[in-house]
Structure formats: structure tokens, C-alpha cells
């Protein structure tokens, strides 16, 4: 069976890393485990990993935004940032604003790697399933 | 044969969903049909679906922009929005502006699903083949 | 072996096309050659090609930004732009700013095709490995 995941935004995320909907809607989870916000790899190989985050706010103050996909493995002391997007000075002060960040690339992942998504400002994330998501598939 | 499509912008179109160039240039269409703006799936399975839209204008008024990939199937009464990008307050009032929206993710699609792309304002889309496109491939 | 590449930003790039890190860090290079900024295809077929570029500056002057993935082959007289992103009027004058451009799509590539990435303003690119990258894989 193809190893694949597509998880969607979960609006009751209260902490980092982001938590994801892994059951309902347009979710996919096959041959990969989901645990506390993370996708857990159980077979070493090449994977295409992607994530989109939809940021929005009522009144722009140009708070710097970041969106990271990172990897954690008990063998390594530190998280590895695989992909990252940053935004600064992206809207007109005081206005309602909205913007997305998209990341996607190929990585060589190892069994037991845990992949997570982090954002700089949780309160500015909108968690609609079509707007904010996290996924991967084994090539 | 690999089921794959890469369609590019078609500039003389006024209709929604967007219509696409399916014959000339860097277009690909194999094992998938194109019909009235839609990619028609003929084999159930996992697909990576993507789209990019290039918006631009002469004089910025921050008209809200949206870019959606959605699915229609005669079995279901309503369109399903698979992926969506929105932009608000993205340029400086009165200036010439340009911005892209990119979407891409994995979905479990069923034979006879029709996939389309919709935008909130057709007049602001530039249809260059390298800038605005819609594609998928079966994993 | 799967034909795949993931190259990351190389900060000593001084000219166009962009040059890439092909050895250290989260780099992948298998069944594809890297030569003077280009990925060289050695087997005809369908490839998913992607790139992300992270632009940033100390003081916004809204210099138009472009990010292109293009193809060169000795059989053809001219470069073919496969994918392109453009940005104009994207930040508030005088402010520190940051923005990414992401491109990704499927193409039918031929043995001996050379793929490159070009940007309009090299001095505004940040080359962190997680932020600026270029990759592909054979479907």
C-alpha cells in the first residue's frame, strides 16, 4: 500500500507544533502514523513532503510570520528545519489581511523520523481544511 | 501509461471555472480527459493535484483574491473545495502589482470525479503558460 | 534507483543562473547530474520539478521580483521558461521585508535537458537551505 498522508487544519490547536485533523473530511493516512501533531515515518525512503498554512487577521500590524516543516528523531539532539517560509511587511497597516505560505520538497526520511509543522503566530492561522494542510507521500 | 496532466492558461476565456490550453505548448494530457475546464478522472486512486494562478493589475485596490481547486461528481449534490488560497491587503494602493497563488496536495480521487479551478476575479488573471497552470498525476 | 534531486541555496552565487549546494546538508542527487547551476536529465520521462526562492531586504523599494525555472537543450536555440513567479508592489516602502516564491509542476523532459533557476535580483535572495531550493523527481 502507498505510504501517504494528507492532514487538515484543526482549529483547537493551542500549542506548537500544530495539531492536525487525522480522521474526518478529506484526510488521508496510510502506512504512516500520526502522533501528537507529527507524521511518523515507518519505512526509510524518499518522500515528497508539503504543507500550506493560511494566515489572516482583522487589522494588519505586519507581525513577522514564519511557517516551518521540521524533523525530529531521537537519534539527533536537535530539530532539523527541512523547509521554511517567512513573511515580513506583507499588508497595509490597519487593514483586514490574508496570505498563504506553501512549502513542498523531496527528502530522504528514515524510519522513526517525526515530521511537524510550526508557525510563529498561532492566533493568525485559519484552520479550514482547504486552506491549511500537511502531507507527504513515498515516491 | 502514467496518468498525468499539465494544462496551461487560456487567455480568451471569460467563463468560470477557468478554461485551459490542452493541446499546444508545454501541455501534458495522458490517461486523463479534459472537458469544459475540468480534468476528468477515469481511474480511482491517489493523485497529487496542483495549480498556480498569476494575478496582476494596473492599479492596486486590494480586491480580495481567491484561487480554488474543487471537485464535482454527479453522485454528490455540492462541489467539494479541495484546496484554496486567499489574499487580502496584498499591495500598495494605486500601484501596478503582481502576485501568485500556488496550491498542491494529495487526494483520493474516484473515477468520474471532475476537477476544476476557480478564481474570484478573472479580469486580474494573467494566462501565460509559465505563470498559470493546473495539473495532476497519479501516484 | 529513483531519479531525484533536492539542491539547496548556495550563498556564493554571483551570477545567473543560480548555483546550488549539491553535496552537504539535506541535499539529494541520484540518477541526475548537477553541472554549473543546472540539473542535467539523463533519462527521458515525466518529472515533477519544483523550486522555492526566499527574497528579503532591509528597506522595501518594491523592486519587481521574478523567479523562473527554465530549460536549455543544445537542440533548441532558446531557453524554455517552464514555470515563473512574479511579484510587484509587495511590501511597504522603507520597511524590512521578506517573501517567498514557490513553483512546482510536471513536465516531460528529454535526456540532455538542462534545468536552471533564474531570479531577477540576486542581492535580494537569502540562501538558507530550508528557504531556497531546487529539486525534481522522476514519476
Amino acid at each position: 500500500l502507498r505510504k501517504v498522508a494528507h492532514l487538515t487544519g484543526k482549529s483547537n490547536s493551542r500549542s506548537m507544533p500544530l495539531e492536525w485533523e487525522d480522521t474526518y473530511g478529506i484526510v488521508l493516512l496510510s502506512g504512516v502514523k500520526y502522533k501528537k501533531g507529527g507524521l511518523v515515518i515507518n519505512e526509510t525512503g524518499l518522500y515528497f513532503v508539503y504543507s500550506k498554512v493560511y494566515f489572516r487577521g482583522q487589522s494588519c500590524n505586519n507581525l513577522p510570520l514564519s511557517h516551518k516543516v521540521y524533523m525530529r528523531n531521537s537519534k539527533y539532539p536537535q530539530d532539523l528545519v527541512m523547509m521554511e517560509g517567512k513573511m515580513m511587511s506583507y499588508c497595509t497597516t490597519g487593514q483586514m489581511w490574508a496570505r498563504s505560505s506553501y512549502l513542498g520538497a523531496v527528502f530522504n526520511l528514515t524510519s522513526a523520523d517525526h515530521l511537524y509543522v510550526n508557525v510563529s503566530e498561532l492566533s493568525l492561522v485559519n484552520f479550514e481544511e482547504s486552506q491549511t494542510f500537511f502531507g507527504l507521500y513515498k515516491l | 501509461l502514467r496518468k498525468v496532466a499539465h494544462l496551461t492558461g487560456k487567455s480568451n476565456s471569460r467563463s468560470m471555472p477557468l478554461e485551459w490550453e490542452d493541446t499546444y505548448g508545454i501541455v501534458l494530457l495522458s490517461g486523463v480527459k479534459y472537458k469544459k475546464g475540468g480534468l476528468v478522472i477515469n481511474e480511482t486512486g491517489l493523485y497529487f493535484v496542483y495549480s498556480k494562478v498569476y494575478f496582476r493589475g494596473q492599479s492596486c485596490n486590494n480586491l480580495p483574491l481567491s484561487h480554488k481547486v474543487y471537485m464535482r461528481n454527479s453522485k454528490y449534490p455540492q462541489d467539494l473545495v479541495m484546496m484554496e488560497g486567499k489574499m487580502m491587503s496584498y499591495c500598495t494602493t494605486g500601484q501596478m502589482w503582481a502576485r501568485s497563488s500556488y496550491l498542491g496536495a494529495v487526494f483520493n480521487l474516484t473515477s468520474a470525479d471532475h476537477l476544476y479551478v476557480n478564481v474570484s476575479e478573472l479580469s486580474l488573471v494573467n494566462f501565460e503558460e509559465s505563470q498559470t497552470f493546473f495539473g495532476l498525476y497519479k501516484l | 534507483l529513483r531519479k531525484v534531486a533536492h539542491l539547496t541555496g548556495k550563498s556564493n552565487s554571483r551570477s545567473m543562473p543560480l548555483e546550488w549546494e549539491d553535496t552537504y546538508g539535506i541535499v539529494l542527487l541520484s540518477g541526475v547530474k548537477y553541472k554549473k547551476g543546472g540539473l542535467v536529465i539523463n533519462e527521458t520521462g515525466l518529472y515533477f520539478v519544483y523550486s522555492k526562492v526566499y527574497f528579503r531586504g532591509q528597506s522595501c523599494n518594491n523592486l519587481p521580483l521574478s523567479h523562473k525555472v527554465y530549460m536549455r537543450n543544445s537542440k533548441y536555440p532558446q531557453d524554455l521558461v517552464m514555470m515563473e513567479g512574479k511579484m510587484m508592489s509587495y511590501c511597504t516602502t522603507g520597511q524590512m521585508w521578506a517573501r517567498s516564491s514557490y513553483l512546482g509542476a510536471v513536465f516531460n523532459l528529454t535526456s540532455a535537458d538542462h534545468l536552471y533557476v533564474n531570479v531577477s535580483e540576486l542581492s535580494l535572495v537569502n540562501f538558507e537551505e530550508s528557504q531556497t531550493f531546487f529539486g525534481l523527481y522522476k514519476l
Partner: antibody, heavy 119, light 111 residues
Framework: QVQLVQSGAEVKKPGSSVKVSCKAS????????ISWVRQAPGQGLEWMGW????????QYNENFKGRATLTTDKSTSTAYMELSSLRSEDTAVYFC????????????WGQGTLVTVSS | EIVMTQSPATLSVSPGERATLSCRAS??????????IHWYQQKPGQPPRLLIF???HLESGIPARFSGSGSGTEFTLTISSLQSEDFAVYYC?????????FGQGTKVEIK
């Protein structure tokens, strides 16, 4: 900058036709609709129809179907509105306006052309 | 067709005061994404000028004292502090479906 320049005032007899032109500049003519809106003396605004210069497609308000004909000439970036079988109640200022396709708001207007129908 | 009804027909206001203009649609002109209502200003002998689009978005070059609100069938144009150049006729227009229709207008005059 975007400009829409209309032809001059016309005086017409009942039963005749009038053709008003609208020359566009400062933008890509084939990417936006041109709508026509009329305003009778001292009255409000009435939408007549739109035409899309990109492919020549058009839509009309039922009140004007069969009497109004919208056309464009892409080579000169000019839109035309012809109204036939004129009657006195067609006396009005006729405006062309650039219209965004999806949002259908009129963001730039011509200066207006007064058409007087009188015997 | 959707009928747009504006009120009041005439509004007498002193310079510096706030003006609130209403526009009611005979059926909803909103979707999940946008409210398809636009506001225009017209002065004698001139074409209309777009002020507000999609119910609440200020057109480029329009002063910030103009604002719009509402959804569904009820919409409002507010001028926070009337200037002498704001005395004019104001029209709302919907673009939810064909035909596009305008309200009959509200004349804002000096009190």
C-alpha cells in the same frame, strides 16, 4: 491610466437608430468587460448589458434585448452600443464603463453621451 | 430581478457630521466568500465614481472617511465626517446575478 472616451451628443428622430462609441486606453482591452449604463434626465442608473472584447460574448438586460447591439473592435480598442427603434423615452445619457468580469463592479466610466430623441 | 431599495431618498446633513445611507436587496446578494454590492458617487454632469466594492472594500484613491458594511440583504454606506465635496447622489449596485441593478439613489444635501 485607464481612460474611456465616448463619442459626442446625438439628436435622433423616433424610429431611427443611434450608435455610440467608447474608445478605451491604458489597460488590456480584451481582459475586462465593457458595460453600458444609461441615465434618463433626473433619473437613476439602468444597466443595459455587457460585452467581453476577448471573445465577443455579450449579455443584455431583458429590457433592451432585440433593440440594443453591443460590439467591439479589438484593433482600435473601441466598444460600440447601437440602439434601434428609438422612442422619446430613450432620451438619456449613455455611459460605457469598464467592468471586472467576476466582481462586475464598474471601476472606470466614460464621460457619457447625451442622446436626444425628438421629432 | 433583484430590486435594490435605497433610503432615505434625500439626506440633509451639516458638514462635519456623519451620514449613514442604506441599501436593501430584495434577496441575498452574498455568497460564502463575498457580498456583491458596490457603491458609487455621482455629481451633476459627471459619470458615477466607484467608492466601495464588495460591500466593504475602499476603492483606490477614495478617502478613508467612506466605509461600507453589511451582508445578505442589508447594506450601509457611511461617511464619517462630511466634506463639502461629498454632497452628491449615491447609488448602490448589485452584481450577484443578471441583470445588474442599481438603487434609485440617495441625495446627500447640505443642511
Amino acid at each position: 491610466q485607464v481612460q474611456l472616451v465616448q463619442s459626442g451628443a446625438e439628436v435622433k428622430k423616433p424610429g431611427s437608430s443611434v450608435k455610440v462609441s467608447c474608445k478605451a486606453s491604458g489597460y488590456t482591452f480584451t481582459r475586462f468587460d465593457i458595460s453600458w449604463v444609461r441615465q434618463a434626465p433626473g433619473q437613476g442608473l439602468e444597466w443595459m448589458g455587457w460585452i467581453f472584447p476577448g471573445d465577443g460574448s455579450s449579455q443584455y438586460n431583458e429590457n433592451f434585448k432585440g433593440r440594443a447591439t453591443l460590439t467591439t473592435d479589438k484593433s482600435t480598442s473601441t466598444a460600440y452600443m447601437e440602439l434601434s427603434s428609438l422612442r422619446s423615452e430613450d432620451t438619456a445619457v449613455y455611459f460605457c464603463a469598464r467592468s471586472l468580469i467576476s466582481t462586475a463592479m464598474f471601476d472606470h466610466w466614460g464621460q457619457g453621451t447625451l442622446v436626444t430623441v425628438s421629432s | 430581478e433583484i430590486v435594490m431599495t435605497q433610503s432615505p431618498a434625500t439626506l440633509s446633513v451639516s458638514p462635519g457630521e456623519r451620514a449613514t445611507l442604506s441599501c436593501r436587496a430584495s434577496k441575498s446578494v452574498s455568497t460564502s466568500d463575498f457580498s456583491y454590492i458596490h457603491w458609487y458617487q455621482q455629481k451633476p454632469g459627471q459619470p458615477p465614481r466607484l467608492l466601495i466594492f464588495l460591500a466593504s472594500h475602499l476603492e483606490s484613491g477614495i478617502p478613508a472617511r467612506f466605509s461600507g458594511s453589511g451582508s445578505g440583504t442589508e447594506f450601509t454606506l457611511t461617511i464619517s465626517s462630511l466634506q463639502s465635496e461629498d454632497f452628491a447622489v449615491y447609488y448602490c449596485q448589485h452584481s450577484r446575478e443578471l441583470p445588474r441593478t442599481f438603487g434609485q439613489g440617495t441625495k446627500v444635501e447640505i443642511k
